[in-house]
């Protein structure tokens, strides 16, 4: 079957796989006149890899809490047994009622865009529900994900999130919208309002049009022992143990303390949804306790003291002292001052010596004072804040915060590439390619100090020499290396990087990028001498910029062959001279040749070679450049992209036969010598014809 080039270009030629995994087809190329020999197009078929999703794809979350995704929720696998690290989820549509984030990253950062199955297995992918202002009983969120692992086809997945007060939540013991307890002065009365006790989330399970005729019935199952509950000034008792959410909302529920001490009080209750006029409805219910704290009327509330942030390295443990948490309270013992964790950061947890390994959520000032309370930095090295509430058991809780700054255990200065200085400029800005500090995350606040300066230049900020600079200045392109001495093609300097109390040193290498145009073209014929001219090496731009004649010094190479100066005319004595130095002018005059040698000790065939040159010009630093080229056995039928000054001996003999023709002109830089241009006049006339005509 015949296929045209335009069909190929148009993507109309398809390969359909059938049979074995390895195979292909033979083809010939033809332009209508000439036909190439046969070619073989190899095709390797891959077994189709299929991705599959297991797991419930549903996540139940307690209101206002953080829940990790687990393998029970989301478990991807592939028919090829792909490493979980390579099973990538992309978040196509993020959650609406909360956010998705990575446990090891700053939880205040942007929303997660992608994550791997391995991270799910590690419990590092977290869903955090954000409490809305309006009460609800059950809310539903969805995450749209795309699972991919090339070469398999992507798979779309939807993760359903159910946020429900029905769930048993260790971090939220109440099933009600609010059950915060009450503070009442000794012997006095206090109103229990919806700020303290609110079951309107039970009502939220009823569609809003019918909600006004529904209510929540509270039945007191254990009455306060040191006071009395009143509804609209009517006492509640065993014979009348009920009150309604609507009465709570109207401010009709009151607790009256009977006096005689400041012991704790409270009541137990059952709450359930009721329909219009108390009819039965299949709504939620809960049994809970409401705490009432009686405080001494004369008591002075505790005064929190200023807190110093706790600083410790990642992976370590540090005691919390009075510098971090302390209060002034003349009428409370340290053991009576209680702290409760309201919200913990994700960079570690608090633990009590002798209190087990797990995190603690309650502790006293006595625990702090005795050094029993410690922070364990098991998360990433980010700053975090504990939101605490502190109370002496007699005053309303006061909010407090404890800042924890996790320092990296070590930092690394990443040097991705040496600093390249353009030759004609002699200066260049440093970037993140040269200097970037990472710990377990990037350290954008890093600072650098020069501990060993460069030999041939200066570091500048704002045009002035400096020995200290910041990552921010690097990122803004403000830190510049400038050569001050034009005698070396490279330099280096050593810096000490400091990030969050940890340091590391690194050496930055500086190289000069030659302002040189190098073009080797296709392969060059072995055994031939070719002309080195501005089509191959050109420092003309450097000459213009420096108003000088650039000089080249051969540092190395070629391995097989040599650079030679060719005689100007046949009257010039001697053959070609070996060259170690030359100028741009020599290149422009066509005075240079490259004798391309054959690799010894092996069968003839393609090879690679190179020249390493140092390029000098007035007023700029030198630069090292290389000319890499491929070589092959001479092929008389092949058009070469450089001017040939001579061809191999064998080819010349062939060319001397009667049927060979004499060239009439010089091959241009891109012209070729299909037949060796060595005719009756011998080698010198070949040179004359090619170089000086």
């Amino acid at each position: 079957r015949t296929r045209s080039g335009s069909q190929l270009d148009g993507g109309l030629v398809l390969f359909s796989h059938r049979g074995t995994l390895d195979g292909g087809f033979r083809f010939r190329l033809s332009d209508g006149e000439h036909t190439s020999p046969g070619h073989f197009f190899r095709v390797t078929a891959q077994k189709q890899v299929l991705l599959s999703l297991k797991g419930s794809q549903t996540l139940t979350v307690c209101p206002g809490s953080v829940q990790p995704l687990s393998s029970q929720t989301l478990r991807a696998s592939s028919s090829a047994g792909t490493d979980p690290q390579l099973l990538l989820y992309r978040v196509v549509r993020g959650p609406q009622l909360g956010r998705l984030f990575h446990a090891q990253q700053d939880s205040t950062g942007e929303a997660l865009v992608n994550f791997t199955q391995a991270e799910v297995y590690a419990g590092n992918i977290l869903y955090e529900h954000e409490m809305p202002p309006e009460p609800f009983w059950e809310a539903h969120d969805t995450l749209e994900l795309q699972l991919s692992s090339p070469p398999a086809r992507d798979v779309a997945a939807t993760l359903a999130v159910a946020v429900s007060f029905e769930a048993a939540c260790p971090q939220r013991p109440s099933h009600l919208w609010k059950n915060k307890g009450l503070w009442v002065p000794e012997g006095q009365r206090a109103r229990i309002t919806v700020a303290a006790l609110d079951a309107s989330n039970l009502l939220a399970s009823v569609p809003s049009p019918q909600r006004s005729e529904h209510d929540v019935l509270f039945q007191v199952t254990q009455f306060p022992s040191r006071g009395q509950l009143l509804v609209s000034e009517e006492p509640l008792h065993a014979g009348q143990p009920h009150f309604l959410q609507s009465q709570l909302a109207a401010g009709q529920l009151v607790y009256a303390h009977g006096g005689g001490g400041t012991q704790q009080d409270g009541f137990h209750f059952r709450a359930h949804l009721q329909g219009p006029a108390g009819a039965s409805v299949a709504g939620p219910q809960t049994s809970e306790a409401f705490a009432i704290t009686v405080r001494d009327v004369n008591e002075r509330p505790p005064q929190p003291q200023a807190s110093v942030p706790l600083r410790l390295t990642r992976g370590s443990r540090a005691p919390i002292s009075r510098a971090q948490l302390s209060v002034v309270d003349p009428d409370s013992a340290p053991g009576e001052i209680e702290y409760e964790v309201q919200r913990a950061p994700h960079n570690g947890f608090l633990s009590l010596v002798g209190g087990g390994l797990g995190p603690v959520t309650r502790f006293t000032q006595a625990d702090v004072d005795s050094g029993r309370l410690a922070f364990v930095a098991n998360g990433s090295s980010v700053a975090g804040i504990f939101q605490l509430s502190m109370s002496d058991g007699a005053s309303p809780p006061l909010p407090m915060s404890l800042a924890v700054d996790i320092l990296p255990s070590a930092i690394e200065v990443q040097l991705r590439a040496p600093l390249e200085v353009p030759q004609a400029l002699g200066r260049s800005s440093l970037s993140q390619q040269q200097l970037r500090v990472v710990s377990d995350r990037e350290e954008p606040e890093a600072a650098y100090r020069l501990i060993q300066g460069p030999q041939y230049g200066h570091l500048l900020v704002g045009g002035r020499p400096t020995s200290a600079f910041s990552q921010f200045q690097i990122d803004q392109g403000e830190v510049v290396f400038a050569f001050t001495n034009s005698s070396s093609s490279h330099d280096h300097f050593r810096v000490l990087a400091l990030a969050r109390g940890v340091n590391a040193s690194a050496v930055v290498n500086v190289t000069v990028r030659a302002l040189l145009h190098v073009w080797a073209g296709g392969p060059w014929p072995q055994g031939a001498t070719l002309r080195l001219d501005p089509t191959v090496l050109d420092a003309g731009e450097l000459a213009n910029r420096t108003d000088s004649v650039p000089r080249f010094r051969l540092l190395e190479g070629p391995r097989h062959g040599r650079v030679v100066r060719v005689p100007r005319a046949r009257t010039e004595p001697g053959g070609s001279q070996l060259v170690e130095q030359f100028t741009q002018q020599d290149l422009e005059d066509g005075r240079l040749g490259l004798e391309v040698g054959r690799p010894e000790g092996r069968a003839p065939g393609p090879a690679g070679d190179s020249l390493t040159l140092e390029l000098w010009a007035q007023g700029v630093p030198p630069a090292v450049a290389s000319l890499d080229f491929a070589t092959e056995p001479y092929n008389a039928a092949r058009p070469y992209s450089v001017a040939l000054l001579s061809v191999p001996e064998a080819a010349r003999t062939e060319a001397g036969k009667p049927e060979s023709s004499t060239p009439t002109g010089e091959p241009g830089p891109m012209a070729s010598s299909p037949e060796p241009a060595v005719a009756k006049g011998g080698f010198l006339s070949f040179l004359e014809a090619n170089m000086f005509s």
Epitope: E234, L244, Q247, H272, P276, A277, G278, A279, S280
Partner: antibody, heavy 117, light 113 residues
């Protein structure tokens, strides 16, 4: 203490309307539903409907739908029950009852309405 | 509508003896969510309005003597007067307060033998 005081007995002609009142005292009027229950002579109890004094919302038994209207006056803590198109079988003692949940904890003394030509 | 039936229609019991009244609903009045039976018992003496004795099938109203007790679940309920007194002579009604229309049983008349 909680009291529900109803209006006095009435005699009505068939086809006429009647309006019985129920005045509440001793508690927060708007906190509790008022139901109306009737009892024909020598018969059992029959629930007619309820009114929420707070919102004015009502719910009537299907049997009385279209004939009964329950209203309230929060300024006097009084609930009214009007029954139209009276027939002889509407002769009964009409009770108002206070409820919080759906049981009736307090009752009025009852109003006898006699429908007779 | 939920239909309530009572048995017996009437009973005569000696003073100090136990009186048992049964009540049956045509459908369950148990709310499985809060595990409550929405059933109440009332006592009515001649010329008086009814008086609440029991609600939620077994919870005695304040001030009601403890000789009155309620039991049962779902559709079958019982009111027991453990030691009948002279003042207990009355008609006893059960009522479902599960859903509207709230309905009463036809009543059971209790007399002294």
């Amino acid at each position: 203490q909680v009291q529900l005081v109803q209006s006095g007995a009435e005699v009505k002609r068939p086809g006429a309307s009647m309006k019985v009142s129920c005045k509440a005292s001793g508690y927060t009027f708007t906190n509790y539903y008022i139901h109306w229950v009737r009892q024909a002579p020598g018969q059992g109890l029959e629930w007619m409907g309820w009114i929420n004094p707070n919102s004015g919302a009502t719910n009537y038994a299907q049997k009385f739908q279209g004939r009964v209207t329950m209203t309230r006056d929060t300024s006097t803590s009084t609930v009214y029950m009007e029954l139209s198109s009276l027939r002889s079988e509407d002769t009964a003692v009409y009770y108002c009852a206070k409820s919080w949940v759906s049981w009736f904890a307090s009752w009025g003394q009852g109003t006898l309405v006699t429908v007779s030509s | 509508d939920i239909v309530m039936t009572q048995s017996p229609d009437s009973l005569a019991v000696s003073l100090g003896e136990r009186a048992t009244i049964n009540c049956k609903s045509s459908q369950s009045v148990l709310n499985s969510k809060n595990n409550r039976n929405y059933l109440a018992w009332y006592q009515q003496k001649p010329g008086q309005p009814p008086k609440l004795l029991i609600y939620w099938a077994s919870t005695r109203e304040s001030g009601v003597p403890d000789r009155f007790s309620g039991s049962g679940s779902g559709t079958d309920f019982t009111l027991t007067i453990s030691g009948l007194q002279a003042e207990d002579v009355a008609v006893y009604y059960c009522q479902q307060h599960y859903s509207t229309p709230f309905t009463f049983g036809p009543g059971t008349k209790v007399d002294i033998k």
